[in-house]
């Protein structure tokens, strides 16, 4: 009678993570008597995967009933496959011995490869906001994919970026891999509504890449431009001075009026108007009773935007050299929260 052979018909098996792998194995004879074991890897460092004789194998089931007398099918199924299960599996026949069973014959091995999807890319931007014309870095990370081959692209508002560096780790063989990429983006004043997108393509995604996004609104700071203007006289001896705060982002802004260097009023931007590009405009105004002043008045609009050092714009209010009228420094009309009378 011919000597027993252990046949593993599949040289390789490819399984998606989460699925069940079937590893086929048959013996050509019932003799010699003894159990079958499955191992991952060869040599002394191999891992025992399934033992017909004893043990507990929550994820492993046999394809056929190994207790049946004439059974020669020793195929197994491994459930809920993960990239960590990748490797070469050997079906090994043991001959009954005393005190220990003795390894008799091994199959040629089946290489189990696991295809695992990359995790959703996570894009993160700089910790602090930056202003237009500055270059900022964005990082994109995705983990847990196999095989190693992967493609990563960067886009800003649909336009592909070219200034980026990508690494896939580890460099050598591994059960799964990670990708890390850093892209450099130059900010413009129009970027409040812009998006940076990291796109990852992998064989497991069937042509439907994964995307991670970052909104530049989280990254950009557009400093305001200031303009102080004197409006036509509203009433006798009264001048309306406005401070136009334009094109700023984010909204966090505090404005202080100074009269000849002394603080007159401080207010926080509330009812702002939004521009098409996502920046904001705001206007504050001050009602000045010029008859209360003998000398010229220097009015300063000082703005602190998003915690940055204050910027300011001044306006010199000319006081004409007419004699003060009686009672001109008594209460002037105060028609709104943004008005201020000088006495």
């Amino acid at each position: 009678e011919e000597e027993l052979q252990v046949i593993q018909p599949d040289k390789s098996v490819l399984v998606a993570a989460g699925e069940t792998a079937t590893l086929r194995c048959t013996a050509t004879s019932l003799i010699p008597v003894g159990p079958i074991q499955w191992f991952r890897g060869a040599g002394p460092g191999r891992e025992l995967i399934y033992n017909q004789k004893e043990g507990h194998f929550p994820r492993v089931t046999t394809v056929s009933d190994l207790t049946k007398r004439n059974n020669m099918d020793f195929s197994i199924r491994i459930g809920n496959i993960t990239p960590a299960d990748a490797g070469t599996y050997y079906c090994v026949k043991f001959r009954k011995g005393s005190p220990d069973d003795v390894e008799f014959k091994s199959g040629a091995g089946t290489e189990l490869s696991v295809r695992a999807k990359p995790s959703a890319p996570v894009v993160s931007g700089p910790a602090a906001r930056a202003t237009p014309q500055h270059t900022v870095s964005f990082t994109c990370e995705s983990h847990g994919f196999s095989p190693r081959d992967i493609t990563l692209k960067w886009f800003k508002n649909g336009n592909e970026l070219s200034d980026f560096q990508t690494n896939v780790d580890p460099v050598g063989e591994s059960v799964s891999y990670s990708i890390h990429s850093t892209a450099k983006v130059v900010l413009t004043r129009e970027d409040v509504h812009s998006q940076v997108i990291c796109e990852v393509a992998h064989v497991t995604l069937q042509g439907d890449p994964l995307r991670g996004t970052a909104n530049l609104s989280e990254t950009i700071r557009v400093p305001p431009t200031l303009e102080v203007t004197q409006q036509p006289v509203r009433a006798e001896n009264q001048v309306n001075v406005t401070c136009q705060v334009r094109k700023f982002y984010p909204q966090r802004l505090q404005l202080t009026w100074l009269e000849n260097g002394n603080v007159s009023r401080t207010e926080t931007a509330s009812t702002v108007t939004e521009n098409k590009d996502g920046t904001y405009n705001w206007m504050s105004w001050l009602l000045v009773n010029v008859s209360a002043h003998r000398d010229d008045v220097k009015l300063t609009c000082q703005v602190e935007h998003d915690g940055q050092p204050a910027v300011s714009k001044s306006h010199d209010l000319k006081v004409s050299a007419h004699p003060k009228e009686q009672g001109s420094n008594t209460a002037a009309e105060n028609t709104g929260s943004n008005e201020r009378n000088i006495y």
Epitope: P35, I49, Q52, H56, D85, F94, D100
Partner: nanobody
Framework: QVQLQESGGGVVQAGDSLRLSCVAS????????MGWFRQAPGKEREFVAG????????YYADSMKGRFTISRDNAKNLVYLQMNSLKPEDTAVYYC?????????????????WGQGTQVTVSS
């Protein structure tokens, strides 16, 4: 050289549960079969439970089957032994073991590396 440190032992009542932990110093922990042995006063050290390096296969001594569960966390270099429905006869020093030696298809009865042990006392 693999260094093993057990923790989680103590004194419990019969019927109680206890979870033992063992942390390994080895960076290649995921390439080591791990297990637990125990030694009661005046007795030989005996195999309790073993787990293969990926955790796919587990082995239990007959008297522990159904009551004890071995598990591992390769990311943290940890192996656990969850012991339920403890009996006074489970009183022993429990040892963590690494690189189990399997002979043929028998349960492991040896190891290359041992921890210092943690005392488990089950009072009736």
């Amino acid at each position: 050289q693999v260094q093993l440190q057990e923790s989680g032992g103590g004194v419990v009542q019969a019927g109680d549960s206890l979870r033992l932990s063992c942390v390994a110093s080895e960076r290649t922990f995921s390439s080591l079969d791990m297990g637990w042995f125990r030694q009661a006063p005046g007795k030989e050290r005996e195999f309790v439970a073993g787990i293969s390096r990926s955790g796919i296969s587990q082995y239990y001594a007959d008297s522990m089957k159904g009551r004890f569960t071995i598990s591992r966390d390769n990311a943290k270099n940890l192996v656990y032994l969850q012991m339920n429905s403890l009996k006074p006869e489970d009183t022993a020093v429990y040892y963590c073991a690494a690189a189990l030696t399997f002979r043929g298809s028998n349960l492991p009865r040896d190891s290359n590396y041992w921890g210092q042990g943690t005392q488990v006392t089950v009072s009736s």
